[in-house]
């Protein structure tokens, strides 16, 4: 899947954790469909 960033957003960002994707793990599976 693809995500595009850089569009305006009103969502608030958590101040305790980065909003970036965590490191990949082999438990990560591609969603079916």
């Amino acid at each position: 899947s693809e995500t595009t960033t850089g569009t305006s957003s009103n969502s608030s960002q958590s101040t305790s954790n980065s909003g970036l994707a965590p490191n990949p793990t082999n438990a990560t599976t591609k969603a079916a469909g």
Partner: antibody, heavy 118, light 107 residues
Framework: EVQLQQSGPELVKPGASVKISCKAS????????MNWVKQSPEKSLEWIGE????????TFNQKFKAKATLTVDRSSTTAYMHLKSLTSEDSAVYYC???????????WGQGTTLTVSS | DVQITQSPSYLAASPGETITIYCRAS??????LAWYQEKPEKTNRLLIY???TLQSGIPSRFRGSGSGKDFTLTVSGLEPEDFAMYYC?????????FGAGTKLDLK
Amino acid sequence: EVQLQQSGPELVKPGASVKISCKASGYEFTGYHMNWVKQSPEKSLEWIGEINPITSDKTFNQKFKAKATLTVDRSSTTAYMHLKSLTSEDSAVYYCARRDYDTSLDYWGQGTTLTVSS
Amino acid sequence: DVQITQSPSYLAASPGETITIYCRASKSISKYLAWYQEKPEKTNRLLIYAGSTLQSGIPSRFRGSGSGKDFTLTVSGLEPEDFAMYYCQQHNEYPLTFGAGTKLDLK
């Protein structure tokens, strides 16, 4: 030792496309997102996007969504970036960089210089 | 997008001196700012991440501080090899964004 070895300089004509490679070694290739960054004198450093080497999920800077295609080949631990419909504004140095969740872009390739000229 | 304003763009100093580079984010990025060093013929080097954490193998004369919107990189007791380009980058949210860079020159 972690290393990201990028392909050599490219001189291409306007309207053409190019594919830059980034061969990773010295770490578990599937454990980190691979990021791509553009460096030009006009705009300094610009983040293009990243790819998850396991799922091939991608996250793009909107500015580059129509310009760049990101892929990986897990068997050769190599990431690729394909740039299409090239113009003089695409002339720049392009870097691959490994992103760790905690530390951000902790290892960088040496850069690939792209020159678009007729 | 989070805009990052880095200053100064140019700095001249002598070995042994202490210098400070500033980065300001257009909105709060918590602690998530990284600093990089760029030198000709070398790969970019991560110095500091999460505002103040020193990357493995980086000398302790490099120090990062700040949170929220305002951050600083201080280099104490400049060594000859420290004269280079420095960039900050937020790693709090997508898209990742960078400061315009600071060129540290030998006075």
